[in-house]
């Protein structure tokens, strides 16, 4: 009998609010013996496969996900989802990643340390649902992101 | 890296068949494959498609006509009861590397043929 | 359902001219939006995806732009070897299911 898989978690490092420029690392986390996560973004066709997973605690498994140079286009929802042979999980909640101008003055937001999206939730009713369409981007005063439908 | 259809034959209406759509050279499990028909002088018309995560869509038109299964190397397309508008060569194909929106790799196609 | 209309159903033009095929979408479809070749006996090329990433070995002559419901193919240098049917599909799966629809079809003649 196949086990039931726990949904991942995805978690941002620094953290969610990023300025242009910067680098972000994406965190995804299942139990052992995943064989592939995958990154995927809300609304864009494109995704991230990476067979790079170590083992995090003896329970958990961890994969990471590194932009380089975060730019506008970056910003959006993201999720995790793994491959524990011989099937899938189902996908993680949602994280937001927001992209602020570097022009900004004292005011502007820090960064927010360590935010995740874990498995808090049972999957909503389009969560079977692996693309699911979101609205296009917003742009805020000084903030890129995407607003998210819940 | 390649997918190749293979069951189509002539068939008279009614009849069940299977079509089979089998991978090699690459790991079936990260791939959607999609199921497309061509009629005789006719366009590309979607049938259906095996997501990675196991999901299976289909046309509006295809439902309840066709079922799509898959196993770890092969996506199988059933045509539960066939009728002569079904005669098309029928091709699977598999998603680009890294992106949903594009479907790179097909197969040569295969022919059904439904008449009496 | 997702209708796609694709325009015009054919077109001819000369060799070293510019051809361009468009493609509406009933309803938006952000980025998951890609065109084909198909040449007759054989299986469709992929040409452009995502919905304007050029596919491996396809020359920078072909060009795919637009997004959410509006796309555009531009072919320009036109050789006899474009002569072929080009269609546009959306792959989009979504909260309301919109995947895998092809346009009618464009039939490109060189002359």
């Known amino acids: 009998q196949e086990e039931d898989l726990p949904r991942p978690s995805i978690s941002a490092e620094p953290g969610t609010v990023i300025p242009l420029g910067s680098h972000v690392t994406f965190v995804c986390r299942g139990p052992v013996g995943v064989q592939t996560f995958r990154l995927e973004r809300e609304s864009r066709s494109t995704y991230n496969d990476t067979e790079d997973v170590s083992q995090a605690s003896p329970s958990e498994s961890e994969a990471r996900f590194r932009i380089d140079s975060v730019s506008e286009g970056n910003a959006g929802p993201y999720r995790c989802i793994y491959y524990k042979p011989p099937k899938w999980s189902e996908q993680s909640d949602y994280l937001e990643l927001l992209v602020k101008e570097t022009s900004g003055g004292p005011d502007s937001p820090d960064t927010e340390p360590g935010s995740s999206a874990g498995p808090t939730q049972r999957p909503s009713d389009n969560s079977h649902n692996e693309h699911a369409p979101a609205s296009q981007g917003l742009k805020a005063e000084h903030l890129y992101h995407h607003h998210h439908h819940h | 890296a390649a997918v190749k259809e293979s069951g189509g034959r002539l068939v008279t209406p009614g009849t069940p068949l299977t079509l089979t759509c089998t991978a090699s050279g690459f790991s079936l499990y990260k791939y959607n494959i999609q199921w497309v028909r061509q009629a005789p002088g006719k366009g590309l018309e979607y049938i259906g498609a095996s997501t990675y995560a196991g999901y299976t869509y289909y046309a509006s038109w295809a439902k309840g006509r066709v079922t799509i299964s898959r196993t770890s190397t092969t996506v199988d397309l059933k045509m539960t009861s066939p009728t002569t508008e079904d005669t098309a060569t029928y091709f699977c194909?598999?998603?680009?590397?890294?992106?949903?929106?594009?479907?790179?790799?097909w197969g040569p196609g295969t022919l059904v043929t439904v008449s009496s | 359902e997702l209708v796609l209309t694709q325009t015009p159903a054919s077109v001819s033009a000369a060799v070293g001219g510019t051809v361009t095929i468009k493609c509406q979408a009933s309803q938006s479809i952000g980025t998951w939006f890609a065109w084909y070749q198909q040449k007759p006996g054989q299986s469709p090329k992929l040409l452009i995806y995502g919905p304007s990433k050029l596919a491996s070995g396809v020359p920078p002559r072909f060009k795919g732009s637009g997004s959410g419901t509006e796309f555009t193919l531009t072919i320009s240098d036109l050789e006899c070897a474009d002569a072929a049917t080009y269609y546009c599909q959306s792959t989009y799966f979504g909260v309301d299911y919109l995947g895998g629809t092809f346009g009618g079809g464009t039939e490109v003649e060189i002359k």
């Open positions: 194909a598999r998603h680009i590397d890294g992106d949903y929106s594009g479907y790179a790799l």
